[in-house]
């Protein structure tokens, strides 16, 4: 799937109005300097690809974020404003239902959400030069 045809301004508005607040809520209790992340993405479609990767897929030390409020709102925004996105999600949704429901916030998940915050911030500033 290619995020090129998404309505980026609508997704940005959804991020600013709700998703960003949910990310902050998830991170509550951690210092902003706790995770030294240098994540980057080159343009808005690439940022969304990276956000998709880290929001809906396991990584080392963090099994799942997909049931978190920010993840559900991210999925909704992408489904609404990225044509054809919903069709890519069928298997993932079915697999999700089979997983255990126990929810544990690990330090690694906090680190990953910190990475997501960086990607979203970059998504919102598409004209900035890469560091």
């Amino acid at each position: 799937y290619d995020f090129t045809n998404c309505d980026f301004e609508k997704i940005k508005a959804a991020y600013l109005s709700t998703i960003s607040k949910d990310l902050i809520t998830y991170m509550s209790g951690t210092k902003s300097t706790e995770f030294n992340n240098t994540v980057s993405c080159s343009n808005r479609p690439h940022c969304l690809t990276e956000i998709q990767s880290l929001t809906f897929n396991p990584t080392a030390g963090c099994a799942s974020l997909a049931k978190e409020m920010f993840a559900m709102k991210t999925k909704a925004a992408l489904a609404i404003w990225c044509p054809g996105y919903s069709e890519t999600q069928i298997n993932a949704t079915q697999a999700m239902k089979k997983r255990r429901k126990r929810k544990v916030t690990t330090n690694k998940c906090l680190e990953q959400v910190s990475q997501l915050q960086g990607l979203w911030r970059r998504f919102n500033r598409p004209l900035l030069k890469q560091q």
């Epitope: 990276e50 897929n57 298997n91």
Partner: nanobody, 117 residues
Framework: EVQLVESGGGLVQAGESLRLSCAAS????????LYWYRQAAGIERELIAS???????NYVDSVKGRFTISRDNAENTMYLQMNSLKAEDTGVYYC???????????WGQGTLVTVSS
């Protein structure tokens, strides 16, 4: 569908280094999230390192600072540089490639790493 083949395993002394490779053929490698798993004797297979298409990496604490995951999308290859190896790093190392949209995951056949103390 992506097919994966690992290489680079072997027998080393504690404190030494190894570099594992995972070569992919087929389509979809570039955008997939890639993983290295380790399976030690009698222990469940553990995800130890991951890397997104854009190079964002995550590690479990037991390997952080010693292992480095990287990928070359042009060459369809992923690597795991393992430094300061310990006896507890012994196991079969598997690479995996996961479609970030539907969760479909392809696995390599594994490569054995033995660290003698």
């Amino acid at each position: 569908e992506v097919q994966l083949v690992e290489s680079g395993g072997g027998l080393v002394q504690a404190g030494e280094s190894l570099r594992l490779s995972c070569a992919a053929s087929g389509s979809g490698f570039g955008v997939n999230i890639l993983y290295w798993y380790r399976q030690a004797a009698g222990i469940e297979r553990e995800l130890i390192a991951s890397i997104t298409s854009g190079g964002i990496t995550n590690y479990v604490d037991s390997v952080k600072g010693r292992f480095t995951i990287s990928r070359d999308n042009a060459e369809n290859t992923m690597y795991l540089q393992m430094n300061s190896l310990k006896a507890e790093d012994t196991g079969v190392y598997y690479c995996a490639s996961r479609n970030i949209f539907d969760g479909t995951t392809e696995w390599g056949q594994g490569t054995l790493v033995t660290v003698s103390s």
